[in-house]
Amino acid sequence: MNGRVDYLVTEEEINLTRGPSGLGFNIVGGTDQQYVSNDSGIYVSRIKENGAAALDGRLQEGDKILSVNGQDLKNLLHQDAVDLFRNAGYAVSLRVQHRLQVQNGPIGHRGEGDPSG
């Protein structure tokens, strides 16, 4: 039996400078395109090689973007979120949520609070 899988959630402010080809990442999500069940948030789906985000190194695929330049991304249509990034200017401040998967307890050991059994 595997140990329980937990997630460590952290938040970070990331300041990116728009490069020659832009910010260099893709997003999924929005009220019309839920990527995570019961969550219409905006998630990073791809970081492009040699783009601004990749060169900065902090933004990761799977991160949830909470705000852009202080503007909340809650309850936005997908295209409205895309437009927000495209119109965000040269210096772009992102508030992001990283979700790090953590194995809780060794294999063969049922961790405390495991719902099974």
Epitope: F25, N26, V28, G30, H78, Q79
Partner: nanobody, 125 residues
Framework: QVQLVESGGGLVQPGGSVRVSCVSS????????IGWFRQAPGKEREGVSC???????YYVDSVKGRFTISRDNAKNTVYLQMNSLKPEDTAVYYC????????????????????WGQGTQVTVS
């Protein structure tokens, strides 16, 4: 492994029609942008049409009203129906896929794509 396979090209008379298909494997089309691009001999690859990750279609001006892009997520296939074909439509047609929407450019920009097919030849003559 992600793979895109185009089919359906061939030799067509001017004014004729053809439908090219792009079948994807290794991923499901939901959340993906899919683009059709073409490259004529001696020319750069150019965007023709694309459908973004929420299903909106885009066309380059030269094909508006003649070409129609559609997707069938259940069959993991994207189609490009090409009508009223002209000799200048002769090219190798490629499909490309990318996960999500680029925050930098529309899906007609070939630099946004991570995955490409091998192409199918369409000759209008």
């Amino acid at each position: 492994q992600v793979q895109l396979v185009e089919s359906g090209g061939g030799l067509v008379q001017p004014g004729g029609s053809v439908r090219v298909s792009c079948v994807s494997s290794g991923f499901i089309l939901d959340y993906y942008a899919i683009g059709w691009f073409r490259q004529a001999p001696g020319k750069e690859r150019e965007g023709v049409s694309c459908i973004d990750s929420v299903g909106r279609a885009y066309y380059v001006d030269s094909v508006k009203g003649r070409f129609t892009i559609s997707r069938d997520n259940a069959k993991n296939t994207v189609y490009l129906q090409m009508n009223s074909l002209k000799p200048e439509d002769t090219a190798v047609y490629y499909c490309a896929a990318d996960f999500g929407s680029s925050v930098d450019s529309t899906c007609l920009n070939n630099q946004q794509y991570g995955y490409w097919g091998q192409g199918t030849q369409v000759t209008v003559s």
